[in-house]
């Protein structure tokens, strides 16, 4: 019956990890909905065999028959699809054989490489395996405190599993959280076990608890939301940065600028230059040259540092970190002093053309 092989999803483990693992890819047994399926456990000397589906113990019921080394599924449904395993327990060790069951109308004919990232939150579980709710992705729940600027969107996640499929409800400060409790309501995505609130306001501050439950149990997780009110101000630059620096000719130097801004800042590094021997134009404004600005190949983190490699005397002078947002502009300056390299003559290089900005 096997029709094709599929890459084994190593994120699924049987309840008791075996001491020997199947090296080949698991075989795939394909059935159409309503069909019956019989699979033989391909393990030698299998005295005691236990079965699992998607890592959960599989027991007999009115549709699933377990006789010796055979598994029979009567009247298959798409929910019977999954990764199955039979484990032979012996006195010395145990061995597990994996296989896939695919109950679908359309018969597949190749590896499904797009479907093996194991990232899916929502899992269809076999209706035979009763299980209390459990968290499926605790990584997504680690950040309990969310400090979010006003008007932003916030998302809380509680990815869970269980059988029957658990329901999820949300509490705010320990009480039922209703749509009418906030202007604009909120969005719940059960498929991804998440709550979304758009355009948060100070009144949204509080504790948000997801309660995930089925008839076999209940679990919950609490997040704290703090809404930071935006204070309209121009960018704030960290005091003392950039700092004055000195280096010898041929050396390297870096200037650092730390920018804090609620509104999206635009950051530039500028050098004060001379034109015709003068630092200022006829209008009294300084001649400036933009050295680095956020753009195609720079992230905010990269723009915060200005590197000058293989320094020449001409690099000496005043450097300015300028940050602007919709409210205003802030800038800090620092000086670069270039010292002659030991035993080298002073370099003289021609000045490039500069634009008045």
């Amino acid at each position: 019956r096997p029709s094709f092989s599929l890459v084994e999803d190593t994120t699924l483990e049987p309840e008791e990890p075996p001491t020997k693992y199947q090296i080949s890819q698991p075989e795939v047994y394909v059935a159409a909905p309503g069909e019956s399926l019989e699979v033989r456990c391909l393990l030698k000397d299998a005295a005691v065999i236990s079965w699992t589906k998607d890592g959960v113990h599989l027991g007999p019921n009115n549709r699933t028959v377990l006789i010796g080394e055979y598994l029979q599924i009567k009247g298959a449904t798409p929910r019977d699809s999954g990764l199955y395993a039979c484990t032979a327990s012996r006195t010395v060790d145990s061995e597990t054989w994996y296989f896939m069951v695919n109950v679908t109308d359309a018969i597949s004919s190749g590896d499904d490489e797009d479907d093996t990232d194991g990232a899916e939150d929502f899992v269809s579980e076999n209706s035979n395996n009763k299980r209390a709710p459990y968290w499926t992705n605790t990584e997504k729940m680690e950040k309990r405190l969310h400090a979010v600027p006003a008007a932003n969107t916030v998302k809380f996640r509680c990815p869970a599993g269980g059988n029957p499929m658990p329901t999820m409800r949300w509490l705010k400060n320990g009480k039922e959280f209703k749509q009418e409790h906030r202007i604009g309501g909120y969005k719940v995505r059960n498929q991804h076990w998440s709550l979304i609130m758009e355009s948060v306001v100070p009144s949204d501050k509080g504790n948000y608890t997801c309660v995930v439950e089925n008839e076999y149990g209940s679990i919950n997780h609490t997040y704290h939301l703090d809404v930071v009110e935006r204070s309209p101000h121009r960018p704030i630059l960290q005091a003392g940065l950039p700092a004055n620096a000195s280096t010898v000719v041929g050396g390297d130097v870096e200037f650092v600028c730390k920018v804090y801004s609620d509104a999206q800042p635009h950051i530039q590094w500028i050098k004060h230059v001379e034109k015709n021997g003068s630092k200022y134009g006829p209008d009294g404004l300084p001649y400036l040259k933009v050295l680095k600005a956020a753009g195609v190949n720079t992230t905010d983190k990269e723009i915060e540092v200005l590197y000058i490699r293989n320094v020449t005397f001409e690099d000496a002078g005043e450097y300015t970190c300028l940050a602007g947002n919709s409210i205003g502009i802030s800038f800090h300056s620092a000086w670069l002093t270039v010292l002659p390299a030991p035993g080298r003559e002073k370099e003289i290089t021609a000045s490039p053309d500069y634009l008045e900005i």
Epitope: A119, F122, Q191, H192
Partner: antibody
Framework: QVQLVQSGAEVKKPGSSVKVSCKAS????????ISWVRQAPGQGLEWMGY????????HYAQKFQGRVTITADESTSTAYMELSSLRSEDTAVYYC??????????WGQGTLVTVSS | DIQMTQSPSSLSASVGDRVTITCRAS??????LAWYQQKPGKAPKLLIY???ILQSGVPSRFSGSGSGTDFTLTISSLQPEDFATYYC?????????FGQGTKVEIK
């Protein structure tokens, strides 16, 4: 191989409606949400809405609210997107896309809808 | 809705070049960002999800980085088949939004 196969190109008059289908094969249809994304000629991608067949959830982009209806038929593993009150600026390629977790991992081949009088 | 600003809108590069495309979100989106490649007349293809995880079958010359509001897609050594349009997608808010796209052309 999981595949999403969409219905063929359509030419529609302004003011009319269009219904595009998206049939899934080779996977468990109800375990995933299906989104619809459109792309006007020479333009970028624009998300329209999604349906989660198993959970019975739909959500639409604000821009299309009231004009778009997304449905699914689990028995045929098919999702549908109906857009009403068509205008010339709705001329676009319409894609269905399967959500794996929350991003779109598998896309249909696209359906060109031309709105012209 | 969360706005995604992608830059540059187009760039010209040669085979073997290192190419960087950036995407900036109007607010923090954690790491809920994916990158897609689209060739003319074809559907988009998933390259990277969760900011930096390479989709199965995608060459390792593609990489993603960033968090919060600033994200980068890097192609370490551009190949002839990489000339295409690239889009970022935020899926933090379920009103999904794409960047405007970056067209990578042959210099």
């Amino acid at each position: 191989q999981v595949q999403l196969v969409q219905s063929g190109a359509e030419v529609k008059k302004p003011g009319s409606s269009v219904k595009v289908s998206c049939k899934a094969s080779g996977g468990t249809f109800s375990s995933y949400a299906i989104s619809w994304v459109r792309q006007a000629p020479g333009q970028g991608l624009e998300w329209m809405g999604y349906i989660s067949p198993y959970m019975g959830e739909t959500h639409y982009a604000q821009k299309f609210q009231g004009r778009v209806t997304i449905t699914a038929d689990e028995s045929t593993s098919t999702a549908y997107m109906e857009l009403s009150s068509l205008r010339s600026e709705d001329t676009a390629v319409y894609y269905c896309a399967r959500e794996s977790y929350e991003y779109f991992d598998i896309w249909g081949q696209g359906t060109l809808v031309t709105v012209s009088s | 809705d969360i706005q995604m600003t992608q830059s540059p809108s187009s760039l010209s590069a040669s085979v073997g070049d290192r190419v960087t495309i950036t995407c900036r979100a109007s607010q923090s989106i954690s790491n809920d960002l994916a990158w897609y490649q689209q060739k003319p007349g074809k559907a988009p293809k998933l390259l990277i999800y969760a900011t930096s995880i390479l989709q199965s079958g995608v060459p390792s010359r593609f990489s993603g980085s960033g968090s919060g509001t600033d994200f980068t897609l890097t192609i370490s050594s551009l190949q002839p088949e990489d000339f295409a349009t690239y889009y970022c997608l935020q899926y933090y808010d379920y009103s999904y939004t794409f960047g405007q796209g970056t067209k990578v052309e042959i210099k």
